[in-house]
Amino acid sequence: AVITGACDKDSQCGGGMCCAVSIWVKSIRICTPMGKLGDSCHPLTRKVPFFGRRMHHTCPCLPGLACLRTSFNRFICLAQK
């Protein structure tokens, strides 16, 4: 598994990571850490493992965390209720 750097699918990344779109270069996907407490997220980001190619630049939240709405269009990783 690739620990960091370019990837195409989640299976190429290490544990606790997903293969997300680079925030710098949209045509590149990089192994990215899953969302920690307080990180921005999107509730429809594909769960790990996803067998296709992601479009989002964020990964889903780490196990035990949920992507919850904090204001109209803002979601962050928070402890599951």
Epitope: V21, K26, H42, P43, L44, T45, R46, K47, P49, F50, F51, G52, R53, R54, M55, H56, H57
Partner: antibody
Framework: EVQLVQSGAEVKKPGASVKVSCKAS????????MHWVRQAPGQGLEWIGY????????TYNQKFKGRVTITVDKSTSTAYLELSSLRSEDTAVYYC??????????????WGQGTLVTVSS | DIVMTQSPDSLAVSLGERATINCKAS??????????MNWYQQKPGQPPKLLIY???NLESGVPDRFSGSGSGTDFTLTISSLQAEDVAVYYC?????????FGQGTKVEIK
């Protein structure tokens, strides 16, 4: 060739439950999610929910929460939709549809032929 | 829920002419510079068929006379040169927020 073959038409009484099956073939079943969509006679499309065929995780339209259950049987590559407490407004064609794995676009690229569920007393 | 409103409800176009269908979302369906909008075609007695995903990406095997555009709340499906086999109902669908919602459909006929 990707194929989704659904079970046959059902006639149910109000208050009853129905379980529709969708047998997949021609691809790696666990690599793709499966959606369920319904269409009332002469009406538009309504998304019911989807399931990860890899781990069984589900996401439901809140409108159906508590009445709908989506499951998969990996050993037979079959997805199921169960809808309980049926009412006349549930009369519709129910479709299973494979998610195309286009990232977060959640696009449904292959569809079953549809199953007509009629709810009538 | 995000409400999708298509216009017009029906459209009659001559063979070989351009057909344009509009879809308006009640709130933006964009995220991270992508637009989360799909388009489907449904012919009588058949299941829907995916035409366009993520606003502008043509599904494999779909003729290139079909194209999708737009962002935010306003989207368009264009058939550049209508063919007889394009007679159908067309639906937009947003997939940026759960529940995924469809427009009411636009019926395209031959004039």
């Amino acid at each position: 060739e990707v194929q989704l073959v659904q079970s046959g038409a059902e006639v149910k009484k109000p208050g009853a439950s129905v379980k529709v099956s969708c047998k997949a073939s021609g691809y790696s079943f666990t690599d793709y999610d499966m959606h369920w969509v319904r269409q009332a006679p002469g009406q538009g499309l309504e998304w019911i929910g989807y399931i990860s065929c890899y781990n069984g995780a589900t996401t439901y339209n809140q409108k159906f929460k508590g009445r709908v259950t989506i499951t998969v049987d990996k050993s037979t590559s079959t997805a199921y939709l169960e809808l309980s407490s049926l009412r006349s407004e549930d009369t519709a064609v129910y479709y299973c549809a494979r998610d195309g794995n286009y990232g977060e676009a959640y696009a449904m690229d292959y569809w079953g032929q549809g199953t007509l569920v009629t709810v009538s007393s | 829920d995000i409400v999708m409103t298509q216009s017009p409800d029906s459209l009659a176009v001559s063979l070989g002419e351009r057909a344009t269908i509009n879809c308006k979302a009640s709130q933006s369906v964009d995220y991270d510079s992508d637009s989360y909008m799909n388009w489907y075609q449904q012919k009588p007695g058949q299941p829907p068929k995916l035409l366009i995903y993520a606003a502008s990406n043509l599904e494999s095997g779909v003729p290139d006379r079909f194209s999708g555009s737009g962002s935010g709340t306003d989207f368009t499906l264009t058939i550049s040169s209508l063919q007889a086999e394009d007679v159908a109902v067309y639906y937009c669908q947003q997939i940026n927020e759960d529940p995924f919602t469809f427009g009411q459909g636009t019926k395209v006929e031959i004039k």
